[in-house]
Interface confidence: low
């Protein structure tokens, strides 16, 4: 009998649901993996892939109702010719709580000594038209904003921004300002991922002189 995959787990972002597993020890070139999915409430395992040689599988298309369902469990077993292992099942229920929150993009512009930021929620192509980030997380959205100034030896963090827009009064400072954003939903336990850094340069020309 083949050994079972040691572990199976989901890594998910908004409408990007990837199942991962660790390979069995001493697998051969002909070893592949079978993937099955259980939707809570149905009581039935559905075969998704009979023979995947990769160590991950994109289950987004078959879990599109994740955000409006009771969740899923997945299982994986090794297959080598006519031999197969026991199933290894994900330890936890894959539900909305397991989705890591991300932002789509962060846009920065300069206006009269202020840096104005606009956070664009993720807009994955796979998401059904009615399932936007804002409709699924309709309340208690927050963003943590980390700002770094170059040159200058400080960073600072603006916490609890409750809107997709934010502003920074620069008090006459000039230089390059780099911003990262991490989303959260205060009523939920989802982890958030820091966005890639966006930078904007502020020079004297951006300040209006007032008497």
């Amino acid at each position: 009998e083949l050994p079972s995959p040691p572990s199976v787990w989901f890594e998910a972002e908004f409408f990007h649901h990837i199942l991962h597993w660790t390979p069995i020890p001493n697998q051969s070139e002909s070893t592949c993996y079978e993937v099955a999915l259980l939707r809570y409430g149905t009581g039935r395992w559905n075969s998704i892939s009979n023979c995947s040689q990769a160590l991950s599988y994109d289950l987004t298309a078959v879990t599109l109702d994740l955000y409006r369902s009771n969740g899923y469990r997945a299982r994986v077993r090794a297959v080598d010719g006519s031999r197969h292992s026991n199933w290894t099942v994900t330890n936890t229920r894959f539900s909305l709580d397991e989705v890591t929150l991300t932002v789509g993009s962060v846009k920065l512009e300069i206006h009269n000594g202020f840096i104005l930021g606009k956070i664009q929620p993720p807009r994955p192509k796979m998401a059904p038209a009615n399932d936007t980030y804002e409709s699924i997380f309709s309340h208690f959205r927050e963003y943590e904003i980390a700002i770094r100034k170059v040159p200058g030896n400080f960073t600072f963090t603006h916490k609890k921004v409750k809107h997709e827009n934010f502003s920074l009064l620069t008090s006459g400072e000039v230089g390059e300002f780099c911003v990262q954003v991490k989303p959260s939903v205060t009523s939920r336990t989802n982890k958030g991922m820091w966005s890639k850094e966006e930078c904007v340069s502020l020079t004297r020309q951006y300040f209006t002189v007032t008497n």
Epitope: F156, T157, H158, L169, S171, E173
Partner: nanobody, 127 residues
């Protein structure tokens, strides 16, 4: 007049933790941006952390690297600095300070923006 009194300093081993407190008296500092600076022997004052009047915004010096957290309890008129993973180079006198403004601005990274200062509490990190 706003008076500030720090406490919680002392001797701690590298890797240890301390929690500094700053109690305000004379009047409430709930409408002030408040923060912590430090001064190591033979060096100038260095910005550590600050928090705005409503607690929505925090700032940290680069050297903090996620080791410190700043918080305030307006009902107790007290400011806190929780310091974890302390290093020998964190040895300094730590000062509590209060500014008069509320707007989130880079000016609060400069000691000249702070009108009120405490007497300081000494933190020594040594084995």
């Amino acid at each position: 007049e706003l008076q500030l009194l720090e406490s919680g300093g002392g001797l701690v081993q590298p890797g240890g933790s301390l929690r500094l407190s700053c109690a305000a008296s004379g009047r409430t500092f709930s409408s002030h941006t408040v923060g912590w600076f430090r001064q190591a022997p033979g060096k100038g004052r260095e910005f550590v952390a600050a928090i705005t009047w409503n607690g929505d915004t925090t700032y940290f010096g680069d050297f903090v690297e996620g080791r410190f957290t700043i918080s305030r309890d307006s009902s107790k008129n007290t400011l806190y600095l929780q310091m974890n993973s302390l290093r020998a180079e964190d040895t300094a006198v730590y000062y509590c300070a209060a500014a008069t403004g509320q707007v989130w601005s880079l000016q609060y990274l400069r000691e000249s923006s702070y009108a009120y200062w405490g007497q300081g509490t000494l933190v020594t990190v040594s084995s």
